[in-house]
């Protein structure tokens, strides 16, 4: 009899008739930038402090009638979803509300900026515990709003935002498109993307994960004891803000990068029906629905990785696409993908003192994506080893020769337009796991890392007959760090990681024929950290 | 609204006297860029966020804002500084005619200017 959304985010070990997970976020303060709120509602009374901040535009229309309960509706509901006593996610979290949206739910980029600045100044004047900022709003892409979010995130604040309700690419909206912000799409009780009238939840590579966002029961501003059901990506973002508050209360030292990785790791995987999304967005959109971790501690031993897709390169011949990891993350591998199959591979390169993943389009190609595998690897020392095209029949090889360095990913990049017209390379000899092998006319890049207790192994899955998709997964306890295809022939569209599975996509088999050209091998590099496991055991 | 415009005028007149001491040449280096919302109905022309380069101090932000007002006044335009940003991003929020954008982009310390736009509850 508990609301479906609370049941959905609760791991089975907490599930009973009641939703009472331990420690309800009491060490965390959640800032809400929204409409005004009804602070004496019984769900939030005494736990939401209404700040004196207000920056809103005038309501549209000369005959607009301001009705308090309508003005408070959106913000009250969201405050209830985050920390409501009886229908909230983080029942112990305290909140502060800033009014940046008027009675029609409309605000401005400038008002939101001033609100974010207010939060930063409050943080400087009176530093408290972890801060979560919930931005249940969206406007068009804004460089300045994204920049402000980036600055606040780098000051140690966790920002959570709505992906937007426009049934569109979230990257076209702000703050949803800001990489430092945790961007949340909405799903319903059937784990399907939420439809809202003719529109619905946004999607795409700028969405980090989804969360319940349809028919969400929460505080209604109509009366101090009323509840109402509301839908939208704001409600979804409020769930994630609540989950973040719970996680930060349990582990106050978590960085934004660690929190994001944990949110992804503990999400329900592959439950969303991707057919709802436009075809070109399916591969880019994370199939993740947020959930609370099954236990508030003990996740520290895991090697956490996530996949970051670049923006599309565009179709020009020399176009490139770049995928970047967050400042606290290590780029452990780099791959590329092109729907047309026309690409010139990818490489890891240094940019501003940090490795990035760059993919290269080919002549006649419709464009490429770069795909970075971004991991949390404390005390890591990673470098890229490159071998130029070998021109020898055995293909190009490169390995990690430094003592204590292990191979975490392989990339290959070529200048010729079509590798498929050349003889494919011989498969890599067995028993040489620290080695990347590629086409003789490609330069090969090995990502080699040294970190305490880091161990990696190569896992392959080859299919002799042509197939549109070949996958290989890392087993329990191991984390996928690298994903590539062998051999690098032209019919391979690219490789990318989905959770702990390496996916290699090929061109439609009907156009390929079943020659040896059709043979595709997916190569996964699976790693784990014994050091993290030991540290975790010592803590317990 | 009328009172506000009165303040507006007063502020501009007060700034005219400072105008002579301010050079108009922009800093050397990259040209500042102008950004606006791609969704036309969401645009709010007439209000602009002037973002200054990262290490700009509050005093420089205020000086740049005053310089813009002075130069605008000389061209017969009213401007109003609505907010000076510091703490997250250096810069200021200004109410002015779009005709002044070219002038504003040439001001020292300016990184980029963004036209204000609407955001909506989701």
């Amino acid at each position: 009899s508990i609301p479906w959304n609370l049941e959905r985010i609760t791991p089975p070990r907490y599930r009973a008739d009641e939703y009472q997970p331990p420690d309800g976020g009491s060490l965390v303060e959640v800032y809400l930038l929204d409409t005004s709120i009804q602070s004496d509602h019984r769900e939030i009374e005494g736990r939401v402090m209404v700040t004196d901040f207000e920056n809103v535009p005038e309501e549209d229309g000369t005959r607009f009638h301001r009705q308090a309960s309508k003005c408070d509706s959106h913000g009250t509901h969201l405050a209830g979803v985050v920390s409501g006593r009886d229908a909230g996610v983080a029942k112990g979290a305290s909140m502060r509300s800033l009014r940046v949206l008027n009675c029609q739910g409309k605000g401005t980029v400038s008002g939101t900026l001033i609100g974010l600045e207010f939060i930063r100044k409050s943080q400087l004047v009176q530093p408290v515990g972890p801060l979560v900022v919930l931005l249940p709003l969206a406007g068009g892409y804004s460089r300045v709003l994204n920049a402000a979010c980036q600055r606040l995130a780098r000051a140690g604040v966790v920002l959570v935002t709505a992906a937007g309700n426009f049934r569109d690419d979230a990257c076209l909206y702000s703050p949803a498109s800001a990489p430092e912000v945790i961007t949340v799409g909405a799903t319903n009780a059937q784990d399907q993307p939420v439809t809202l009238g003719t529109l619905g939840t946004n999607f795409g590579r700028c969405v980090d994960l989804f969360a319940p966002g349809e028919d969400i029961i929460g505080a209604s501003s109509d009366c101090s004891t009323c509840f109402v059901s509301q839908s939208g990506t704001s409600q979804a973002a409020a769930h994630v803000a609540g989950i973040a508050a719970m996680m930060l209360s349990a582990e106050p030292e978590l960085t934004l990068a660690e929190l994001r990785q944990r949110l992804i790791h503990f999400s329900a995987k592959d439950v969303i029906n991707e057919a709802w999304f436009p075809e070109d967005q399916r591969v880019l959109t994370p199939n993740l629905v947020a959930a609370l971790p099954p236990s508030t501690h003990g996740a520290g031993w895991q090697l956490f990785c996530r996949t970051v897709w670049s923006a599309h390169s565009g179709p020009t011949r020399m176009a490139t696409a770049v995928a970047r990891c967050a400042p606290d993350e290590e780029l452990l591998s780099c791959s590329s993908f092109s729907r047309s199959g026309k690409r010139r591979g990818e490489r890891m390169e240094a940019q501003g003192g940090k490795l990035v993943c760059r993919a290269h389009n080919a002549f006649g190609g419709e464009g490429v994506y770069a795909i970075a595998r971004c991991c949390l690897l404390p005390q890591a020392n990673c470098s890229v080893h490159t071998a130029p095209p070998a021109e020898a029949s055995m293909g190009t090889r490169v390995h990690c020769h430094q003592q204590g360095h292990v191979l975490t990913g392989c990339s290959s990049h070529w200048e010729v337009e079509d590798l498929g017209t050349h003889k494919p390379p011989v498969l890599r000899p067995r028993g040489q796991p620290n080695q990347c092998v590629g086409h003789r006319e490609a330069s090969i890049h090995a990502s080699c890392c040294h970190a305490p207790g880091l161990e990696c192994k190569v896992k392959e899955h080859g299919i002799p007959a042509p197939q549109e998709q070949v996958t290989v997964a890392c087993e329990e306890g191991w984390t996928l760090t690298g994903c590539s295809a062998l051999p690098g022939t032209s019919h391979v569209l690219g490789a990318y990681a989905v959770d702990n599975t390496c996916v290699v996509r090929s061109r439609d088999v009907s156009t390929t024929g079943s020659t040896s050209e059709g043979a595709v091998t997916a190569v996964a590099i699976c790693c784990r950290s014994r050091h993290l496991a030991q540290a975790s055991q010592e803590l317990q | 609204q009328e009172d506000e415009d009165g303040d507006y005028e007063e502020l501009v007149l007060a700034l005219r006297s400072e105008e002579d001491g301010l050079a108009e040449a922009p800093e050397h280096g990259t040209t500042a860029t102008f950004h606006r919302c791609a969704k036309d109905p969401w645009r709010l022309p007439g209000t602009y966020v002037v973002v200054l380069k990262e290490e700009t101090h509050l005093s420089q932000s205020e000086r740049t804002a005053r310089r813009l007002q002075a130069q605008a006044a000389r061209r017969g335009y009213l401007t109003k500084i609505l907010h000076v940003f510091h703490g997250l991003l250096p810069g200021f929020l200004v109410k002015m005619s779009g005709d002044l954008l070219e002038l504003a982009l040439k001001l020292p310390h300016v990184d980029y200017i963004e036209e204000d736009s609407s955001v909506f509850a989701q």
């Epitope: 009899s1 009641e18 009472q20 006593r85 009886d86 029942k91 004891t225 009323c226 | -």
Partner: antibody
Framework: QLQLQESGPGLVKPSETLSLTCTVS??????????WGWIRQPPGKGLEWIGS???????YYNPFLKSRVTISVDTSKNQFSLKLSSVTAADTAVYYC??????????????????WGQGTLVTVSS | EIVLTQSPATLSLSPGERATLSCRAS??????LAWYQQKPGQAPRLLIY???NRATGIPARFSGSGSGTDFTLTISSLEPEDFAVYYC????????FGGGTKVEIK
């Protein structure tokens, strides 16, 4: 069907603490669908809401009585209790316990009171 | 605090007659108003909720109307068992009850 039964002393001395318990039968107190409330009625007068509690322990009190009221729940016994401190003759009343639909689960309906216990008279006198 | 004022304090009518009870709120309670019936020595019983909705098992002769600050409970034809005290209650801002209207036999 669901029944509520108030119990506790019928006589309390001024300045002492009034303690009452409500036992719920025919249904579980640990349901998200309901709050459990106390309401009183001084002799010959109208009704006054004292406060309510949710199965999780969340409490809501009448602002005018808040400083003196404590409501608690014992889900294992299917009971909830009222404590009213520093009583005076003005606290003499029939005390009712009642179920209140929470609204948290829409199917339960809006939050009005019913069913009620039959009430217990508490007299404050020395 | 929202104050509810009921009128008249006492209504003397005969069985079969129409009873009209009024409840006025000190500020708008929207439609968040209920009516209860209480007989001597018994607990109150919910009749009408959200201004006009009949509770389960309540006869059709009971009807509620109004919104904002003015509400009416109507008993179209009084039955002998309807003679009792009637209270209105709001939930717009926490819970308060009216002082009651006693419907007695004339």
């Amino acid at each position: 069907q669901l029944q509520l039964q108030e119990s506790g002393p019928g006589l309390v001395k001024p300045s002492e603490t009034l303690s009452l318990t409500c036992t719920v039968s025919g249904g579980s107190i640990s349901s998200s669908s309901y709050y459990w409330g106390w309401i009183r009625q001084p002799p010959g007068k109208g009704l006054e809401w004292i406060g309510s509690i949710y199965y999780s322990g969340s409490t809501y009190y009448n602002p005018f009585l808040k400083s003196r009221v404590t409501i608690s729940v014992d889900t294992s016994k299917n009971q909830f209790s009222l404590k009213l401190s520093s009583v005076t003759a003005a606290d003499t009343a029939v005390y009712y316990c009642a179920r209140e639909n929470s609204g948290v689960v829409p199917a339960a309906g809006p939050n009005w009171f019913g069913p009620w216990g039959q009430g217990t008279l508490v007299t404050v006198s020395s | 605090e929202i104050v509810l004022t009921q009128s008249p304090a006492t209504l003397s009518l005969s069985p079969g007659e129409r009873a009209t009870l009024s409840c006025r709120a000190s500020q708008s309670v929207s439609s968040y108003l209920a009516w209860y019936q209480q007989k001597p020595g018994q607990a109150p019983r919910l009749l009408i909720y959200d201004a006009s909705n009949r509770a389960t098992g309540i006869p059709a002769r009971f009807s509620g109307s109004g919104s904002g600050t003015d509400f009416t409970l109507t008993i179209s034809s009084l039955e002998p068992e309807d003679f009792a005290v009637y209270y209105c209650q709001q939930r717009r801002n926490w819970f308060t009850f009216g002082g009651g209207t006693k419907v007695e036999i004339k």
